[in-house]
C-alpha cells in the first residue's frame, strides 16, 4: 500500500504564439481545480475507462478575475498535493490523466458551472520511494507543470511497496535473512505471509495471501511439478520426494524482452536491455516523444515524432541536462577575471569589472604596462587609469604602430617650412633664423647665437634634425 502524490506547479499559457484567452473575466470570476486519474501498466484506454489505480480531486483554487486587457497569466492554484492512495503493490509503470477544470462563480441558476479547460495524459515508469519526478505537458495553448512521486505507507517498503517492515524484536539486529528497512533503520523487514499451504520450497509471494510458483512448478500452492520424468539425472537429495523435475526454462528462454530488447539473467530475475525508444521491464513501453513535452525551461524538442526515435532537447542558454532540467550556474566557472563580479542574467553573462579593468571578462588591465608592447621603439607610460605609449619620432597611434606625419605638429618655428624625411623631418628656416627647428635668430652682425655651424652648412641653409 502507498500513496501517489501529485504537485501542480503552474497552469498557464504555453510558449509561442496564440496565447489562450483567460478562462475568467470580471463578469464571470472563476477558480480552478484538478482531477488526476491513474491506471496500472501502459493502458491506451479512453479517458472514460476506470481509474483502476485510483483518482483524486484537488481543492478549489483561489477565485480569479481577469484584469481587462492583460494576457492570461499563470492561474492561481489550489493549495496542497493531490494524493491517490493505492491498496496493492505499486505497478512501476502507469498511465495518468490530469484534468484542469474551471468552476465559474457567476450568477448561474443552480450554483456554479463546471467546464473542462484542459486534459493531459501520459505513460510513465516510476519506482516507489524515489525522488520527485518533474514533468511538463501541453494541451492546446495551455501548459501544465507538475511533479509526482509514489511513496509506500508503513509498514510497506521497496520499489513496489511489497516488502513489509515491523519494529525490531531485538535492539541490535534483524532476524536471520531479514534486512533493516531503509530509511526506517529501527525497523526490520517482516517476512510476508503467503497463502496458507503455499510451498515454502517452490512458491513465494510478493503480497500477503498470494502464492506464486517458481520455474517448473504449478498448482494453487506450487506443489505440482510442471513435468515429471523417469529419474535419468537425479538433481540431489531434495528431489527424492517429488520425482525428477525437468529443468524449467531459464528466465531468458523464449526472450521475454519485446521490441528487439536483449535479455540477460540477473541473480534472481532477468533484465532487458532495450533498443533506443523503448523502456520498461520488458521493453514494452514506447519511449517518451516530443508529443509528451519532455523539454523543460523552454527547451526545444527535436525528433521523436514516432516512438522508435529518441527525442533531443536543445536547451536555452543557462540550462542543461537531457531535458534541460538543470540550471547551469555559469558563474561557478568564474569567468570574470581580475576580481570582476559575475552576473548570470539568464540570457547572457555579464561581468562587472573592478576599477582599472575592462573587457567582456575584465581581462584588460587598464593601468598595467606589463605585457603592453609599444612598437617602433615607443615606451609605455602608466597613469590616469590608462596606459599609453610615448612614441618615437615618426610614429603614432595607441601602440606606435602607425607611421606619423612628422610635420603635422608644425615643428618649424618662425615660419620655417617643414619637409618630411625618411628619418624624421627637415626645417627650411626663414631668413634670419636657424637651428633644427629654426628656433634661433641669426644676429645682425652675422654671428650666430650658436657655436659655429658644422662644416658644410652655412647659416640660413635648411637644418636637418638629427
Amino acid at each position: 500500500a502507498g500513496v501517489f502524490e501529485l504537485q501542480i506547479h503552474s497552469f498557464g499559457p504555453g510558449p509561442g504564439p496564440g496565447a489562450p484567452r483567460s478562462p475568467c473575466s470580471a463578469r464571470l470570476p472563476c477558480r480552478l481545480f484538478f482531477r488526476v486519474c491513474l491506471k496500472p501498466g501502459l493502458s491506451e484506454e479512453a479517458a472514460e475507462s476506470p481509474c483502476a489505480l485510483g483518482a483524486a480531486l484537488s481543492a478549489r483554487g483561489p477565485v480569479y478575475t481577469e484584469q481587462p486587457g492583460a494576457p492570461a497569466p499563470d492561474l492561481p492554484l489550489p493549495d496542497g498535493l493531490l494524493q491517490v492512495p493505492f491498496r496493492d503493490a505499486w505497478p512501476g509503470t502507469f498511465s495518468f490523466i490530469i484534468e484542469t477544470w474551471r468552476e465559474e462563480l457567476g450568477d448561474q441558476i443552480g450554483g456554479p458551472a463546471w467546464s473542462l479547460l484542459a486534459r493531459v495524459a501520459g505513460r510513465r515508469r516510476l519506482a516507489a520511494g524515489g525522488p520527485w519526478a518533474r514533468d511538463i505537458q501541453r494541451a492546446g495553448a495551455w501548459e501544465l507543470r507538475f511533479s509526482y512521486r509514489a511513496r509506500c505507507e508503513p509498514p510497506a517498503v521497496g520499489t513496489a511497496c511489497t516488502r513489509l517492515c515491523r519494529p525490531r524484536s531485538a535492539p541490535s539486529r534483524c532476524g536471520p535473512g531479514l534486512r533493516p528497512c531503509a530509511p526506517l533503520e529501527d525497523e526490520c523487514e517482516a517476512p510476508l505471509v503467503c497463502r496458507a499451504g503455499c510451498s515454502p520450497e517452490h512458491g513465494f509471494c510478493e503480497q500477503p495471501g498470494e502464492c506464486r510458483c517458481l520455474e517448473g512448478w504449478t498448482g494453487p500452492l506450487c506443489t505440482v511439478p510442471v513435468s515429471t520424468s523417469s529419474c535419468l539425472s537425479p538433481r540431489g537429495p531434495s528431489s527424492a520426494t517429488t520425482g525428477c523435475l525437468v529443468p524449467g526454462p531459464g528466465p531468458c528462454d523464449g526472450n521475454p524482452c519485446a521490441n528487439g530488447g536483449s535479455c540477460s539473467e540477473t541473480p534472481r530475475s532477468f533484465e532487458c536491455t532495450c533498443p533506443r525508444g523503448f523502456y520498461g521491464l520488458r521493453c514494452e513501453v514506447s519511449g517518451v516523444t516530443c508529443a509528451d513535452g519532455p523539454c523543460f525551461n523552454g527547451g526545444l524538442c527535436v525528433g521523436g515524432a514516432d516512438p522508435d526515435s529518441a527525442y533531443i532537447c536543445h536547451c536555452p542558454p543557462g540550462f542543461q541536462g537531457s531535458n534541460c532540467e538543470k540550471r547551469v550556474d555559469r558563474c561557478s566557472l568564474q569567468p570574470c577575471r581580475n576580481g570582476g563580479l559575475c552576473l548570470d542574467l539568464g540570457h547572457a553573462l555579464r561581468c562587472r569589472c573592478r576599477a582599472g579593468f575592462a573587457g567582456p571578462r575584465c581581462e584588460h588591465d587598464l593601468d598595467d604596462c606589463a605585457g603592453r608592447a609599444c612598437a617602433n621603439g615607443g615606451t609605455c607610460v602608466e597613469g590616469g587609469g590608462a596606459h599609453r605609449c610615448s612614441c618615437a619620432l615618426g610614429f603614432g597611434g595607441r601602440d606606435c604602430r602607425e607611421r606619423a606625419d612628422p610635420c603635422a605638429a608644425r615643428p618649424c618655428a618662425h615660419g620655417g617650412r617643414c619637409y618630411a624625411h625618411f628619418s624624421g623631418l627637415v626645417c627650411a628656416c626663414a631668413p634670419g633664423y636657424m637651428g633644427a627647428r629654426c628656433e634661433f635668430p641669426v644676429h645682425p652682425d652675422g654671428a650666430s647665437a650658436l657655436p659655429a655651424a658644422p662644416p658644410g652648412l652655412r647659416p640660413g641653409d635648411p637644418q636637418r634634425y638629427l
Epitope: 520499489t159 517452490h202 540477460s264
Partner: antibody, heavy 126, light 108 residues
C-alpha cells in the same frame, strides 16, 4: 558464525564427472534471500563464477559451462552440491563455495558473496 | 558478457602513500551490484567493499570505493603493510557474473 567448507575428490581423470560438496553452518538455505554460489580459480589466475542456487531453488549457471554443470542443495543437511561433467585439464583449479546474501542497494534488492570457504584443490590429470 | 578490466595489473606503493586502482566495465553495471574482494596468497577471497562504496565488516576506514556506470575505483588513503594483496572487482548484475583480472598491490 558463518562458515563454509568445500570437499571434493582432489584428483580425477579427464572425461570423468567432478562432484563437489559445500557444507555450511551459521545460516540456512530455507531463509528467504539466501543463496550459495560456486567460484573457481586456476593457480595463479583470476576468479571465475560457475553457478549459484537460491533458497527457493532458483538456479543460475555460467552460460559457457551450462551444459556441463548441475547445482543442487539439501536444505536439511545444509549442503550444496556441484557436478561438472566431462572434465578436462582446463578444469584444474581451486574451487570455492560462497554464501550469497542480500545487501542494501540504492533501489531494489542486490546481492553479494559475503562469506567464502577455504577452497578445495582439484586436479584433472591423466 | 560484461568484461571487467582492472588497472594497473600490478602496482607497488610505499607505506603511507595514497593508492587508487580502477575497474572498467565493458557495459554499464548497476552500482549496487559492483563489489570488491581482497585475496592474499594461500587464502580465499574476502568481501571488502560492497555496492560500490560500502565497507564490509572489519575493513579499515582508510579504504573507500566510488564510481558508477562503467567506471569504478578502490582507494586506500594511506597504504599499510597489511594492505598488500590482490584486489578483484566483481559485478553481480548480469549473468555471467564476472570478476576483474585483479590488481596486485605490493609494498615498495
Amino acid at each position: 558464525q558463518v562458515t563454509l567448507k568445500e570437499s571434493g575428490p582432489g584428483i580425477l581423470q579427464p572425461s570423468q564427472t567432478l562432484s563437489l560438496t559445500c557444507s555450511f553452518s551459521g545460516f540456512s538455505l530455507s531463509t528467504s534471500g539466501m543463496g550459495v554460489g560456486w567460484i573457481r580459480q586456476p593457480s595463479g589466475k583470476g576468479l571465475e563464477w560457475l553457478a549459484l542456487i537460491w533458497w527457493d531453488d532458483v538456479k543460475r549457471y555460467h552460460p559457457a559451462l551450462k551444459s556441463r554443470l548441475t547445482i543442487s542443495k539439501d536444505t536439511s543437511s545444509s549442503q550444496v552440491f556441484l557436478k561438472i561433467a566431462s572434465v578436462d585439464t582446463a578444469d584444474t583449479a581451486t574451487y570455492y563455495c560462497a554464501r550469497i546474501a542480500e545487501v542494501t542497494g540504492q533501489v531494489g534488492l542486490h546481492y553479494a558473496m559475503d562469506y567464502w570457504g577455504q577452497g578445495t584443490s582439484v586436479t584433472v590429470s591423466s | 558478457q560484461t568484461v571487467l578490466t582492472q588497472s594497473p595489473a600490478i602496482m607497488s606503493a610505499s607505506l603511507g602513500e595514497r593508492v587508487t586502482m580502477t575497474c572498467t566495465a565493458s557495459s554499464s553495471v548497476n552500482s549496487s551490484s559492483l563489489h570488491w574482494y581482497q585475496q592474499k596468497p594461500g587464502s580465499s577471497p574476502k568481501l571488502w567493499i560492497y555496492t560500490t562504496s560500502n565497507l564490509a565488516s572489519g575493513v579499515p576506514a582508510r579504504f573507500s570505493g566510488s564510481g558508477s556506470g562503467t567506471s569504478y575505483s578502490l582507494t586506500i588513503s594511506s597504504m599499510e603493510a597489511e594492505d598488500a594483496a590482490t584486489y578483484y572487482c566483481h559485478q553481480f548484475h548480469r549473468s555471467p557474473f564476472t570478476f576483474g583480472s585483479g590488481t596486485k598491490l605490493e609494498i615498495k
